[in-house]
């Protein structure tokens, strides 16, 4: 089941999925001046069996001015730095995503890919939030959001994160230890049962990740 909305946006924060649940789709978008090859896929799809998940289809872009198809290459470091994604492209993978059953890793970049990745998430997907560079967490409760099914409708739980400019905060008595909770909203506040995610095993690890994994500013 696809999630109806995008994950919540938080002022001066970005979000990232550490892995993508089977059923997730990633649009094959090309940067300006390029287009999908004629017979090319519209999207990549995370699929798999009980032991292994991977992305089906390959995205390929070609110059709008020529008919030549492009080969799949990894961008040079300068190009990589330019790329922004909806969930913040990360220079390293802090979690061993291959060991997470039913999930795919971040897909590798393709040549002349658009600067922003558009994902279509499925129920059970979890994303993690971090303040952007120049901001820090004034308050951090459970700083993740999960797409859940409630009353036949999908919704994202609310991440509890407030970011403030580093010079704005009156007092920082001690560094916060991020809390890891699978719920964006306490169960006592929901009026019926909701589906849970099998992605919660990552919460503890991802909630304590170094901020260095979140390098791309995206608002």
């Amino acid at each position: 089941e696809l999630c109806d909305d995008d994950p919540p946006e938080i002022p001066h924060a970005t979000f990232k999925a550490m892995a993508y649940k089977e059923g997730t789709m990633l649009n094959c978008e090309c940067k300006r001046g390029f287009r999908r090859i004629k017979s090319g896929s519209l999207y990549m799809l995370c699929t798999g069996n009980s032991s292994h998940s991977s992305w089906d289809n390959q995205c390929q872009c070609t110059s709008s001015a020529t008919r030549n198809t492009t080969k799949q290459v990894t961008p040079q470091p300068e190009e990589q730095k330019e790329r922004k994604t909806t969930e913040m492209q990360s220079p390293m993978q802090p979690v061993d995503q291959a060991s997470l059953p039913g999930h795919c890793r971040e897909p590798p970049p393709w040549e002349n890919e658009a600067t922003e990745r558009i994902y279509h998430f499925v129920v059970g997907q979890m994303v993690y939030y971090q303040c952007v560079q120049g901001y820090r967490a004034l308050h951090r409760g459970p700083a993740e959001s999960v797409c859940k099914m409630t009353h036949g409708k999908t919704r994202w739980t609310q991440p509890q994160l407030i970011c403030t400019g580093e010079m704005e905060t009156s007092q920082f008595p001690g560094e916060e230890k991020p809390q890891a909770s699978p719920e964006g909203r306490p169960e006592s506040e929901t009026s019926c049962l909701v589906t849970t995610t099998d992605f919660q095993i990552q919460t503890e690890m991802a909630a304590t990740m170094e901020t260095s994994i979140f390098t791309t500013e995206y608002q």
């Epitope: 308050h139 609310q158 509890q160 403030t164 001690g174 809390q179």
Partner: antibody
């Protein structure tokens, strides 16, 4: 049921200090930050500051020029707002309000009237 | 600080009327704007957040729109119980700042 219950009305003399409490219940108190908002009689709303109920981090509105101090007692799920050097223009209703995810103030306290009079 | 200029400061309208209240921020607040309704002697109640997201339980006659610096609250068909004062709030930057309020009266 989520509730924010504030302490009762106060009458203070100019120059005094007032401390108002706001007790949260029905939810995990330390997951949600707490804000304080002032409303003078017949006037609009003024944001005073916010505290992280988890870490104690605060951010204040400089309009209150260091007269406001927000604290938290996690053991009793209570936030406090202290306003010092009171003057007559501090006569107002003071609200605590919980911050919920990507929007502030999903639940409010009932308000506490503070009257400053000589 | 970001200034929020709300207009009109008061208005009178009839039941069934379409009512609009506007808020202008002194800088781009990237849609981090909420609308509140406050009735006399009561705490404010959130109607809209993120400029256009309706809070659960709020009647669908209320809607929000706008981006950048300019935002609007619309009541599509005014009801007697909508008599109240309405405030906007920006929460893009600290300190959070409210509009001056719009007092809505029923003719």
């Amino acid at each position: 049921e989520v509730q924010l219950v504030q302490s009762g009305a106060e009458v203070k003399k100019p120059g005094a200090t007032v401390k108002i409490s706001c007790k949260g219940s029905g939810y995990t108190f330390t997951d949600y930050a707490m804000h304080w908002v002032q409303q003078a009689p017949g006037k609009g709303l003024e944001w005073m500051g916010v505290i992280s109920t988890y870490s104690g981090n605060t951010n204040y509105n400089q309009k209150f020029k260091g007269r406001v101090t927000i604290t938290v007692d996690k053991s009793t799920s209570t936030a406090y707002m202290e306003l010092s050097s009171l003057r007559s223009e501090d006569t107002a209703v003071y609200y605590c309000a919980r911050s919920y995810g990507n929007y502030p103030f999903d639940y409010w306290g009932q308000g506490t009237l503070v009257t400053v009079s000589s | 600080d970001i200034q929020m200029t709300q207009s009109p400061s008061s208005l009178s309208a009839s039941v069934g009327d379409r009512v609009t209240i506007t808020c202008k921020a002194s800088q781009d607040i990237t849609s981090y704007l909420s609308w509140f309704q406050q009735k006399p002697g009561k705490a404010p109640k959130t109607l809209i957040y993120r400029a256009n997201r309706l809070v659960d339980g709020v009647p669908s006659r209320f809607s929000g729109s706008g981006s950048g610096q300019d935002y609007t609250l619309t009541i599509s068909s005014l009801q007697p119980e909508d008599m109240a004062t309405y405030y906007c709030l920006q929460y893009d930057e600290f300190p959070y700042t409210f509009g001056q309020g719009t007092k809505l009266e029923i003719k």
